[in-house]
Every structure is written in structure tokens, then in C-alpha cells.
Interface confidence: medium
């Protein structure tokens, strides 16, 4: 058993049929010694008396808010949550496996630049009685500070018969050094509590590996005289690290016909303009990637050819 | 070329070669990016590598003030990786394919380090400890880890030279 926060405790249980469970001793936080009784949740049934209560925690029915009273007055509470371990593996019932970039990916994180700011998100099908708490650091044995905000519900989607909820959190490294080569990974830890079930999820990454620039901005076409060619120009996204002479991007320019089956013409360039042939009903798209490190491409910025 | 006493390197040549190094490092093992090579305990064990750290003067301001600190750190790293790529980790079994970019990568690391340090001037360089893996599978894993680390190192070096070529060239 360990303390998650004040008056909230997590009991770690091996979860199998007829498991013996864990013996837990609760102590009433009071100077009083006599006349103390214990109840669980809203029930008025007295579970025991005395300053301490010893219980055998085996299942969710044994978890909940234990309250000690004296003469009708509440003295203190202890909320017991369960963390299940099945076949040596902690349960992951609360969050959905996003399966990208690999199986057992519950948390996904992205950064728009090298400033030390990043966003993580996760999915669940649970809509109520759900709380999240997020902590982060750079390195784990000698952790350096990363500050995370509160997790918020950022999207709701319908997937078949189910509703899916996306939560996200923003974090910022306290003393980020954008130009340095990272040697210790960022660690992100999410505590999830659904009713009386506790689970924790972790992710470990370098900012450089989760970089995904915003799409290029101000995408414009300029027809070239007496030619089917156009000059496409764009700018670095506002959110990208500066100076651009140091934090450089490379770009992919794509000409795509109306039909997805039509052949795509692609040009790669380090410049912020390119000359391409504009076909009727086609569109021109540009996306960006860090020039020197192959992290994710941005989403496409697009304009129609006409 | 970087000359003792602090005159400028051939920023544009260094830029071109460092950008080529980035391309080669990723083509040497493109899938490495999608492998999680940091097993438990690794945070503790991968740190004795010449990382370009915050105080090394490789940021735009540091380069403007005095690029020599940064260039020396980059040189140290280039020699470090050049020696690793020339060691039995890459020359031993399982053999690399004949068209593997590792050979080119090795030569380019050497080429860039020589651009930074002409004959007759010696920055002290790292004695690389012999990793001498005993099993072919250990060698394979080490190759992945070394290339992954090299990708991060040369990305920073390439940014330094690109910025230098754009803003510090005579």
C-alpha cells in the first residue's frame, strides 16, 4: 500500500481467482483513543471499532472511502483504490491502446518545435468518474523539472457503437536548451483513476523524436507567363524554432489530381518556393520536416490549382 | 578549416558535408527511428558519449561569441563516432551489405573531422573504449544504438554549420 495523495491510498493486488489479497491497517487521524467506529462509503454498518482498523483487501468491494467517527462526528477519511496485477502485468483497462507507432502505446506526445513544450494525449471509452494526474521530468534518476498543466477533455468521437474521449495535457521543460543534443529522455507519467481503480501509464522520449512541425503558412501560387508552370511559395510556420538559419526545415511539394488514383508528382526542396506544373482540378500541397533529423512530417497545407 | 588561434572553418564546406552525414546516418538505418532501443536502465548507461550539451556554445548566440568551443566539441564527437564505425562492431559479423552506407558514413565523418582540424594542429581526442561485443546479436544491437545516437549528434552539428554558413561566413 502506498499514498497517492493526502488520504488516498493505492493497494497493489495480485489479481487471480481466490487470491489472498492484502492485509491493510488503517489508522484514524485523531488524538482520540476511545469510542471510535469505522464505516465504508455511504453505509452506516460499523466495520470495526478502535483507533486502527485491519481489513483484508481482495476485491473492489473492499475498496472505497473508509471513515472513522466518534459520537456522530467524522474524524478522518482514507480512500482505498486498487491497482490490479494480472500474470505479473499491471492492468491497462482505463486507456485505449492507440497501437501507433507500436502496440501498447497508451500515451502519444508531439512537439511543434524545440522549445521544450510538448503535448500528450490519450484515449478512453469511459465518460464518468474519471480523473487524471500528470507528472513529467527529464531523466528519472536525477530528474530535471518539467511542468505539466491539468489534463483536459480535448475531443469526443463516435467509433461504431462507442463514444471515444480524448484527453490531452501540455507540458513545458523548465530549463529547456533547444540547441543541445538531448542525452536524457523526457519521462511522462499519468495516474488514472476510474471509480476505485488506479492505473498508471508512462512514456519516455526525446523531444527530437516527437517533433512534428505545423504546416507551412501563406501558401501561394504565382502563374509563370506562357507556361503551365506555377511558382509555389510558402513560409515557415510561426510555431517553428528560430532562427531558421539554425533550425531549418525541408519541404515536400505535391501536385494531386482530383482523383486519389491519379499519379502524384512530388518535389523535395530546402527552399521556400518551387516550380511545378499545375494540372486542371488539381491541388498543390506542401508539408515540412526538420531538415537534419527525420522526425514526423507536418500535415499538408493545400491550395487549389485553379 | 579551423585553425588554432580561432580563425573560421570553411563553413559552407562543413555545411554540405554535415548535411550529407545526416542523410547517410538515416539511410544507414532508417528504421532505427521506429525501434525503441532504450531498454530499462539505459538512461544510466548511454551517457558517456560526447553529447553537444547546453554549455558547449553550439547555440546561435554561443557561435556568434566564440565558435571554437563548439567546433572542438563537434570534432571530438566526429572522431568518437568515426572510431566506433571503424571498429569490430561494424566490421565484424554479421557483415554489412556491400552497398551499405556505413562505409560512406565512416569516410564522411573522417572528412568533416579533417576539415575542422588541419594537419599539425591537434585537439585532444577521445580514446574510445573497446566495446568488444561477444555475440553477433550484441553487435547488431550496438550498431542500431550507435547509429541512433549518431543521428542526433550530426543533426546538431549540421544546424551549427548551416547557421555558420548563413551568418558567420566571411
Amino acid at each position: 500500500i502506498w499514498e497517492l495523495k493526502k488520504d488516498v491510498y493505492v493497494v497493489e493486488l495480485d489479481w487471480y481467482p481466490d487470491a489472498p489479497g492484502e492485509m491493510v491497517v488503517l489508522t484514524c487521524d485523531t488524538p482520540e483513543e476511545d469510542g471510535i467506529t469505522w464505516t465504508l462509503d455511504q453505509s452506516s454498518e460499523v466495520l470495526g471499532s478502535g483507533k486502527t482498523l485491519t481489513i483484508q483487501v481482495k476485491e473492489f468491494g473492499d475498496a472505497g472511502q473508509y471513515t472513522c467517527h466518534k459520537g456522530g462526528e467524522v474524524l478522518s477519511h482514507s480512500l482505498l483504490l486498487l491497482h490490479k496485477k494480472e500474470d505479473g502485468i499491471w492492468s491497462t483497462d482505463i486507456l485505449k491502446d492507440q497501437k501507433e507507432p507500436k502496440n501498447k502505446t497508451f500515451l502519444r506526445c508531439e512537439a511543434k518545435n524545440y522549445s521544450g513544450r510538448f503535448t500528450c494525449w490519450w484515449l478512453t471509452t469511459i465518460s464518468t468518474d474519471l480523473t487524471f494526474s500528470v507528472k513529467s521530468s527529464r531523466g528519472s534518476s536525477d530528474p530535471q523539472g518539467v511542468t505539466c498543466g491539468a489534463a483536459t477533455l480535448s475531443a469526443e468521437r463516435v467509433r461504431g457503437d462507442n463514444k471515444e474521449y480524448e484527453y490531452s495535457v501540455e507540458c513545458q521543460e523548465d530549463s529547456a536548451c533547444p540547441a543541445a543534443e538531448e542525452s536524457l529522455p523526457i519521462e511522462v507519467m499519468v495516474d488514472a483513476v476510474h471509480k476505485l481503480k488506479y492505473e498508471n501509464y508512462t512514456s519516455s522520449f526525446f523531444i527530437r523524436d516527437i517533433i512534428k512541425p505545423d504546416p507551412p503558412k501563406n501558401l501561394q501560387l504565382k502563374p509563370l507567363k506562357n507556361s503551365r508552370q506555377v511558382e509555389v511559395s510558402w513560409e515557415y510556420p510561426d510555431t517553428w524554432s528560430t532562427p531558421h538559419s539554425y533550425f531549418s526545415l525541408t519541404f515536400c511539394v505535391q501536385v494531386q489530381g482530383k482523383s486519389k488514383r491519379e499519379k502524384k508528382d512530388r518535389v523535395f526542396t530546402d527552399k521556400t518556393s518551387a516550380t511545378v506544373i499545375c494540372r486542371k482540378n488539381a491541388s498543390i500541397s506542401v508539408r515540412a520536416q526538420d531538415r537534419y533529423y527525420s522526425s514526423s512530417w507536418s500535415e499538408w497545407a493545400s491550395v487549389p490549382c485553379s | 578549416r579551423a585553425v588554432p588561434g580561432g580563425s573560421s572553418p570553411a563553413w559552407t564546406q562543413c555545411q554540405q558535408l554535415s548535411q550529407k552525414l545526416c542523410t547517410l546516418a538515416w539511410s544507414a538505418h532508417p528504421l532505427v527511428g521506429h525501434m525503441d532501443l532504450r531498454e530499462e536502465g539505459d538512461e544510466e548507461t548511454t551517457n558517456d558519449v560526447p553529447h553537444i550539451q547546453c554549455g558547449d556554445g553550439c547555440d546561435p548566440q554561443g557561435l556568434r561569441d566564440n565558435s571554437q568551443f563548439c567546433l572542438q566539441r563537434i570534432h571530438q564527437g566526429l572522431i568518437f563516432y568515426e572510431k566506433l564505425l571503424g571498429s569490430d562492431i561494424f566490421t565484424g559479423e554479421p557483415s554489412l551489405l556491400p552497398d551499405s552506407p556505413v562505409g560512406q558514413l565512416h569516410a564522411s565523418l573522417l572528412g568533416l573531422s579533417q576539415l575542422l582540424q588541419p594537419e599539425g594542429h591537434h585537439w585532444e581526442t577521445q580514446q574510445i573504449p573497446s566495446l568488444s561485443p561477444s555475440q553477433p546479436w550484441q553487435r547488431l544491437l550496438l550498431r542500431f544504438k550507435i547509429l541512433r545516437s549518431l543521428q542526433a549528434f550530426v543533426a546538431v552539428a549540421a544546424r551549427v554549420f548551416a547557421h555558420g554558413a548563413a551568418t558567420l561566413s566571411p
Epitope: 534518476s141 536525477d142 | 531498454e39 530499462e40 536502465g41 539505459d42 544510466e44 548507461t45 548511454t46 551517457n47 558517456d48 558519449v49 560526447p50 550539451q53 571530438q76 568518437f80 585532444e124 581526442t125 577521445q126 580514446q127 573504449p129 566495446l131 561485443p133 561477444s134 544491437l141 550496438l142 544504438k145 550507435i146 545516437s149
Partner: antibody
Framework: EVQLLESGGGLVQPGGSLRLSCAAS????????MMWVRQAPGKGLEWVSS????????MYADSVKGRFTISRDNSKNTLYLQMNSLRAEDTAVYYC???????????????WGQGTLVTVSS | QSELTQPASVSGSPGQSITISCSGT?????????VSWYQERPGKVPKLIIY???NRPSGISSRFSGSKSGNTASLTISGLQAEDEADYFC??????????FGTGTKVTVL
């Protein structure tokens, strides 16, 4: 040739302080993690402390935590161990040793100094 | 854990093989493959003879070999020779980034 030379040992009273130095040569000192290991008379070896190449991270044995401080000066190729609040049980030969860790391969103590004797006694 | 457990002494006749065990926990020996062995001859400084469980530094005789099973590492000296008489210490990196030594084993060549 790799060489490590400790100095600064001697007789000190309980509660006293001592600063050990280790001068390194024959290798690029700034690239290796360095450690102090001690051996009490007639006893086994005990790891005391280690410091990463940049000096950015230090680790200590529980027996010395809060009393000893490891540091390094890469420009002088020198490792230090500041020992405060010394106790009789700190009496030992203190060795400076070079270690490293690369890509999931950890090696400790491939080269050792000759050691310097610290005696804590009243 | 403050020390890894080794037998206090092991002896053997010249030409024989002996094995020294080094018992730890899942936080040190069992946690990874960063186990090394040192030979300490009287009046000499410790000498690294095995690292990463089973690797020998250059110059170390192939008569020395290492292995590991679970939380226990072993050092085997085959073809025992008079010059092998010394104290032997195992050492393990721990998952918290520290190091721990064994209690030491005195090897006597009969």
C-alpha cells in the same frame, strides 16, 4: 599510457575533513565517468562515489551520502573527493578508478590508481 | 543491498577448475548484464578480469570465464595455476545507477 595518481590521504581526527585528488593522464579525462572505491584494512572493496563525464551527475554510496562530495575539473584532468564529518569507519585505502558506459555496456574500474591511505583516529 | 554475497574461500589443485559464485538481487546482478570481476593479488591494485558478465578485457587469459543465471553471477577459473592465488571480487551496476561489490573470495591453489 593511462595513469591515475591519488594524493591527499593522511591521518585525521573523527569529525575532521580531508580532500583527496586524483590526477589523470594518458586518456581524454573529460570523456570518462570517474569513481572512488575504498578498501578498509583487511576488508573488501566498497564503491564510494561516481561522477559522469560532464560532472553533471553524481552518485554516492549510502554510507557516505551527505558527508562526501565528488567533483572534477576537466581542464586540469583531476578528480576530487571532499570528505567531511569523517568517522573511524571511513579509514581505508581510497582508489580512484576510471569507468565508462556506452550504448548499454557498463564497465567499471578498467584502470586504477595506487591508492591513498586515509586514517581516521583520535 | 550493501554487498553481494560470495563464498569466503575456494581452493583447488593446479590444473583443476574452480567456480566462485556472486549472489545478488533483481536490482543489481539480476537486473542487467553489467557484472564485472576483479582479481586482487597481495599488495597490488585490483585488476579487471571480466566485464559485462562474460567479456574479457584484452590481455586476460581465456582460462577466466564468467556467466550468470538469475540473480547469481559466477566466475570460473579453469586450469588453475599458482599465479591465480588472489582475492576475487564481483561487482554489479545497480538499477539506481550505483555500484555494489561482493564480499570477496580468497582463492588458494593447493
Amino acid at each position: 599510457e593511462v595513469q591515475l595518481l591519488e594524493s591527499g590521504g593522511g591521518l585525521v581526527q573523527p569529525g575532521g575533513s580531508l580532500r583527496l585528488s586524483c590526477a589523470a593522464s594518458g586518456f581524454t579525462f573529460s570523456m570518462y565517468r570517474m569513481m572512488w572505491v575504498r578498501q578498509a584494512p583487511g576488508k573488501g572493496l566498497e564503491w564510494v562515489s561516481s561522477i559522469r563525464p560532464s560532472g553533471g551527475m553524481t552518485m554516492y554510496a549510502d554510507s557516505v551520502k551527505g558527508r562526501f562530495t565528488i567533483s572534477r575539473d576537466n581542464s586540469k584532468n583531476t578528480l576530487y573527493l571532499q570528505m567531511n564529518s569523517l568517522r573511524a569507519e571511513d579509514t581505508a585505502v581510497y582508489y580512484c578508478t576510471r569507468g565508462w558506459a556506452l550504448f548499454g555496456v557498463v564497465r567499471m574500474g578498467d584502470y586504477w590508481g595506487q591508492g591513498t591511505l586515509v586514517t581516521v583516529s583520535s | 543491498q550493501s554487498e553481494l554475497t560470495q563464498p569466503a574461500s575456494v581452493s583447488g589443485s593446479p590444473g583443476q577448475s574452480i567456480t566462485i559464485s556472486c549472489s545478488g538481487t533483481s536490482s543489481d546482478v539480476g537486473g542487467h548484464n553489467f557484472v564485472s570481476w576483479y582479481q586482487e593479488r597481495p599488495g597490488k591494485v585490483p585488476k579487471l578480469i571480466i566485464y559485462d558478465v562474460n567479456n574479457r578485457p584484452s590481455g586476460i587469459s581465456s582460462r577466466f570465464s564468467g556467466s550468470k543465471s538469475g540473480n547469481t553471477a559466477s566466475l570460473t577459473i579453469s586450469g588453475l595455476q599458482a599465479e591465480d592465488e588472489a582475492d576475487y571480487f564481483c561487482n554489479s551496476y545497480t538499477i539506481t545507477g550505483t555500484y555494489v561489490f561482493g564480499t570477496g573470495t580468497k582463492v588458494t591453489v593447493l
